[in-house]
Interface confidence: medium
């Protein structure tokens, strides 16, 4: 009885730092990801970030975190599935296709880490109001951002 | 060194066609997504044509759409270019790029001229 007594507690503090420690560190490298990813996408403009896509963002008091972050890989979905082969967005020079390119690569990166956070299997997207894409992922990464200062301090 | 050689141009009638190879060599072929390029006279460099590593994702150009069908043999590394109905405005040297976040590497082009 002794021995397990005294173990006891300097187990419960490793188990406990242990789980601490694993869930920041899953925090820190999803949002790491996600925010290096909306750093990539909003320093560079290509022929469609001006594109309107749903603005989840304009009514959302009511919203979890997580149903935010499934709506919004929705929207990022709805935007690349739409606009992967839109030859008005690939361009006419090497440049242009290849910055495309790269928007939709970045685009799909972003909604499957969206996708991770949220947790969720589908979410509704119905607002009516539009913002450009640009502005949209101006938004999203503010939001990630807080939540990434929240989850590190 | 990187090679890219490309051959079956020449000069055509308008609605004619021609099939432009591109052999490559130095690289591993079936890695990389390839791309035409052209230049007409006194114009930039536009891309024409981009294909992905295996073959099954192809990109077109909003001018050649439904005329132009771009494939690869990656086991003779080889990229081709079918291109149909052809116009006098297609008149330009066709070259093939390797592409991996840019065309890196350029071939010494091909002169496809559509005249009557």
């Known amino acids: 009885m002794g021995l397990t007594s005294q173990l006891l507690p300097p187990l419960f503090f490793l188990l406990a730092c242990a789980g601490n420690f694993v869930h920041g560190h899953k925090c820190d490298i999803t949002l790491q990801e996600i925010i290096k990813t909306l750093n990539s996408l909003t320093e560079q403009k290509t022929l469609c970030t001006e594109l309107t896509v749903t603005d989840i963002f304009a009514a959302s008091k009511n919203t979890t975190e997580k149903e935010t972050f499934c709506r919004a890989a929705t929207v990022l979905r709805q935007f690349y599935s739409h606009h992967e082969k839109d030859t008005r967005c690939l361009g006419a020079t090497a440049q242009q296709f290849h910055r495309h390119k790269q928007l939709i690569r970045f685009l799909k990166r972003l909604d499957r880490n969206l996708w991770g956070l949220a947790g969720l299997n589908s979410c509704p997207v119905k607002e009516a109001n539009q913002s450009t894409l640009e502005n949209f992922l101006e938004r999203l990464k503010t939001i990630m951002r807080e939540k990434y200062s929240k989850c590190s301090s | 060194e990187v090679q890219l050689l490309e051959s079956g141009g020449g000069l055509v009638q308008p609605g004619g066609s021609l099939r432009l190879s591109c052999a490559a060599s130095g690289f591993t072929f079936r890695n990389y997504g390839m791309a035409w390029v052209r230049q007409a006279p006194g114009k930039g460099l536009e891309w024409v044509s981009w294909?992905?590593?295996?073959?099954?994702?192809?990109y077109y150009a909003d001018f050649v759409k439904g005329r132009f069908t771009i494939s690869r043999d990656n086991s003779k590394n080889t990229l081709y270019l079918q291109m149909n109905s052809l116009r006098a405005e297609d008149t330009a040297v066709y070259y093939c790029?390797?592409?991996?976040?840019?065309?890196?590497?350029w071939g010494q082009g091909t002169l496809v001229t559509v005249s009557s």
């Open positions: 294909i992905n590593s295996n073959g099954r994702e192809t």
């Open positions: 790029a390797k592409s991996l976040g840019r065309f890196d590497y």
